[in-house]
C-alpha cells in the first residue's frame, strides 16, 4: 500500500522540514526559512511562532519543529501551548479583576499563581493544629488529642489571631 | 493601521525627571488597558505599570512604586508614564502595550509599541 500511494502521490515522499513544491514539479523543497514541517508529504510548510511582548522563547524553530514560548520573568504560562501570560503574585496573594490582594484569614496560597484556598480543617480528621496556618502555608496538622500518651507534653497552639494590619476582605 | 508609538525618552540625570508618552493611531486607545514594560541590555522585559480601561485603576512594580505615575488622556489617544526620581537602574527601553483582556493579561495579539529609550546618568 505505501509504495502504491508513493507511486500516486509524489508527495507522500517528502520529509518533515520540507514540502512539496508544486511549482517545481512535486519535487521536495526545504522549509524556507522563519517556517517548518512536523510530518511529511505535506503541501506547505507552516510559519515559525514567534514568541515577542511579553512572550520569550524557550525553543527556538527548526525546520521541523515549532518555536515554544514562556513568560518574561514576573508573569507564567496559561493556556494550550503557553497562548497567554498572567501576571504572578506573591505568594500570600491571589489575582483579581482589581489586581494581587492578600488571601482573606483562613486562607492561603504557597504559589506565585491560582487563587488562596481554606486552611486544611485538622478536626475534620480528629486531629489538632500543630502549628497554624498563615497567609502562604496552610495549618500543620498534629496527632489527635486520643493519640498522645499520658504524661506525653501536648502543644495546645493558641485560637488563631488576626495578622496585624490585615483585615478580612 | 493599529500601531502604538513610544516618546519622551531621553537623557536624564539621576533624580531628574521625565514624561513619556505612548500613542494610539488606528484603534481607541480608551477601550484598552496598557501596559508599561521596560528591557536593559542584557536583562529581561520587565513589567512596570499598567493602567486599566475601565475605571482608570493604576498599578506599578515594587521598583517604580511612589516615583512613576500612569494616566491617560482618551480624548488625545494617549497614555502617560511620568517618571520622577529617577535612578541609573531605570536606564532601558521603555515600551506600551495594549493586551486585549486586563492589565494582568498578555496575549501574542497584543499591541506593542517599538520603545523608547531612556538613559539615566549618575
Known amino acids: 500500500f505505501e509504495r502504491t500511494r508513493s507511486l500516486q502521490d509524489p508527495c507522500s515522499n517528502c520529509p518533515a522540514g520540507t514540502f512539496c513544491d508544486n511549482n517545481r514539479n512535486q519535487i521536495c523543497s526545504p522549509c524556507p526559512p522563519n517556517s517548518f514541517s512536523s510530518a511529511g508529504g505535506q503541501r506547505t510548510c507552516d510559519i515559525c511562532r514567534q514568541c515577542k511582548g511579553v512572550f520569550r522563547t524557550r525553543k527556538e524553530c527548526s525546520s521541523t519543529s515549532n518555536a515554544e514560548c514562556d513568560c518574561t520573568p514576573g508573569f507564567h504560562c496559561l493556556g494550550a501551548g503557553c497562548s497567554m501570560c498572567e501576571q504572578d503574585c506573591k505568594q500570600g496573594q491571589e489575582l483579581t479583576k482589581k489586581g494581587c490582594k492578600d488571601c482573606c484569614f483562613g486562607t492561603f496560597n504557597d504559589q506565585k499563581r491560582g487563587i488562596c484556598r481554606p486552611w486544611t480543617n485538622c478536626s475534620l480528621d480528629g486531629k489538632s493544629v500543630l502549628v497554624n496556618g498563615t497567609k502562604e502555608r496552610d495549618v500543620v496538622c498534629g496527632p489527635s488529642p486520643a493519640d498522645l500518651s499520658p504524661g506525653a507534653s501536648s502543644v495546645t497552639p493558641p485560637a488563631p489571631a488576626r495578622e496585624p494590619g490585615h483585615s478580612p476582605q | 493601521q493599529v500601531q502604538l508609538q513610544e516618546s519622551g525618552g531621553g537623557l536624564v540625570q539621576a533624580g531628574g525627571s521625565l514624561r513619556l508618552s505612548c500613542a494610539a493611531s488606528g484603534f481607541s486607545l480608551g477601550l484598552y488597558a496598557i501596559g508599561w514594560f521596560r528591557q536593559a541590555p542584557g536583562k529581561e522585559r520587565e513589567w512596570v505599570s499598567c493602567?486599566?480601561?475601565?475605571?482608570?485603576?493604576?498599578y506599578y512594580a515594587d521598583s517604580v512604586k511612589g516615583r512613576f505615575t500612569v494616566s491617560r488622556d482618551n480624548a488625545k489617544n494617549t497614555v502617560y508614564l511620568q517618571m520622577n526620581r529617577l535612578k541609573p537602574e531605570d536606564t532601558a527601553v521603555y515600551y506600551c502595550?495594549?493586551?486585549?483582556?486586563?492589565?494582568?493579561?498578555?496575549?501574542?495579539?497584543?499591541?506593542w509599541g517599538q520603545g523608547t529609550q531612556v538613559t539615566v546618568s549618575s
Open positions: 502595550a495594549a493586551p486585549q483582556s486586563d492589565c494582568f493579561h498578555y496575549s501574542e495579539n497584543d499591541y
Open positions: 493602567i486599566m480601561s475601565s475605571d482608570s485603576s493604576a
